[in-house]
Interface confidence: medium
């Protein structure tokens, strides 16, 4: 399932994926003066099996000067209305992409490719943000965004990242250290089960929701 929207924009920040989920598409875009070869692919697709993921199709660009007399228009697939872009120049923290099953690495560059890559992300994709040069990060939470499916609608979570100019933040040394994504802390209270309800909602999906009640000593 493709994500409907672009990842959120954060002032003075860029985002990048460290690895790409299977199903991700990358447009075959060529730099000015070049075009896709006549029989070339529209996009590369991250595909794979249980043990290995890789990019299907290869992007190939050729000089527009060699164009034959028939004008060729570059069609975009109908479902690719939304353009997800990442700038290739943005340096991000390294990550061992090979350790992420079901993901493809950053595709290697192809000859005469455009300076900006246009990705079409799928549900579950995570992108990471960092401040552009000349700005520093004051982290208030995780600097990442995840595309999630909700109510049949895709949404990107909001990255908790603030980028400010160096001069404004010189009184906050060390604040640019990234924080880990907050995980739910394990419960450690000594609570007893008072009542449990065993009513179950029978559904065609066999999904059930049960509620029960705990009490804890106020501390």
């Amino acid at each position: 399932e493709l994500c409907d929207d672009d990842p959120p924009e954060i002032p003075h920040a860029t985002f990048k994926a460290m690895a790409y989920k299977e199903g991700t598409m990358l447009n075959c875009e060529c730099k000015r003066g070049f075009r896709r070869i006549k029989s070339g692919s529209l996009y590369m697709l991250c595909t794979g099996n249980s043990s290995h993921s890789s990019w299907d199709n290869q992007c190939q660009c050729t000089s527009s000067a060699t164009r034959n007399t028939t004008k060729q228009v570059t069609p975009q697939p109908e479902e690719q209305k939304e353009r997800k872009t990442t700038e290739m120049q943005s340096p991000m923290q390294p990550v061992d992409q090979a350790s992420l099953p079901g993901h493809c690495r950053e595709p290697p560059p192809w000859e005469n490719e455009a300076t900006e890559r246009i990705y079409h992300f799928v549900v579950g994709q995570m992108v990471y943000y960092q401040c552009v040069q000349g700005y520093r990060a004051l982290h208030r939470g995780p600097a990442e965004s995840v595309c999630k499916m909700t109510h049949g609608k895709t949404r990107w979570t909001q990255p908790q990242l603030i980028c400010t100019g160096e001069m404004e933040t010189s009184q906050f040394p060390g604040e640019e250290k990234p924080q880990a994504s907050p995980e739910g802390r394990p419960e450690s209270e000594t609570s007893c089960l008072v009542t449990t309800t065993d009513f179950q909602i029978q559904t065609e999906m066999a999904a059930t929701m049960e509620t029960s009640i705990f009490t804890t000593e106020y501390q």
Partner: antibody, heavy 103, light 105 residues
Framework: PGESLKISCKGS????????IGWVRQMPGKGLEWMGI????????RYSPSFQGQVTISADKSISTAYLQWSSLKASDTAMYYC?????????WGQGTLVTVSS | WMTQSPSTLSASVGDRVTITCRAS??????LAWYQQRPGRAPKLLMY???NLKSGVPSRFSGSGSGTEFTLTISSLQPDDFATYYC?????????FGPGTKVDIK
């Protein structure tokens, strides 16, 4: 009043970490109020401004259970509390937990 | 915020019933309708304004987009006497309408 309380909601029959789980309050004789939701996969949580700071929503994905917690109950917290799964609409609901706060 | 009209509706079995829900700003088609019978949990009827949830009788239908939405019951049945809520899920915080109670005339 003043006591802490934690109610729970267990989901089963679907991928618990792939759907938001949320809570709705219904005070006696009143309508439905959306309190907040949590995505158990990564504990991402969103609250209604009306409930931010008043309650805590959490989840334990290892036992497919979401929680709604108060640190200090008030009489005005007396209500029925429903959990729901957030799929195509709030598509599946718990049967509700009645919380009564009285001295 | 969401408003509903009417707040109470008296009707008879077999009647065609229409409930209106208005949003204070455009919510696209991200609207759901719920039915709640006394003492029971709410039940989803419609999602994305006009999509009928599987298992819900076809006498229920929904329409609208933007700021104005309607829920229609083509032929009211005894089981349909309940309170109906609309709810937007276009943006946080998700909000419910105040409800429309459908009772027996």
């Amino acid at each position: 009043p003043g006591e802490s309380l934690k109610i729970s909601c267990k989901g089963s029959g679907y991928s618990f970490t792939s759907y938001w789980i949320g809570w709705v309050r219904q005070m006696p004789g009143k309508g439905l109020e959306w309190m907040g939701i949590i995505y158990p996969g990564d504990s991402d949580t969103r609250y209604s401004p009306s409930f931010q700071g008043q309650v805590t929503i959490s989840a334990d994905k290892s036992i497919s259970t979401a929680y709604l917690q108060w640190s200090s109950l008030k009489a005005s917290d007396t209500a029925m509390y429903y959990c729901f799964r957030f799929g195509e609409g709030f598509d599946y609901w718990g049967q509700g937990t009645l919380v009564t706060v009285s001295s | 915020w969401m408003t509903q009209s009417p707040s109470t509706l008296s009707a008879s079995v077999g009647d065609r019933v229409t409930i209106t829900c208005r949003a204070s700003q455009s919510i696209g088609y991200w609207l759901a309708w719920y039915q709640q019978r006394p003492g029971r949990a709410p039940k989803l009827l419609m999602y994305r304004a006009s999509n009928l949830k599987s298992g819900v009788p076809s006498r229920f239908s929904g329409s609208g987009s933007g700021t104005e939405f309607t829920l229609t019951i083509s032929s009211l049945q005894p089981d349909d006497f309940a309170t109906y809520y609309c709810q937007q899920y276009n943006s946080y915080p998700f909000t419910f309408g105040p409800g429309t109670k459908v009772d027996i005339k």
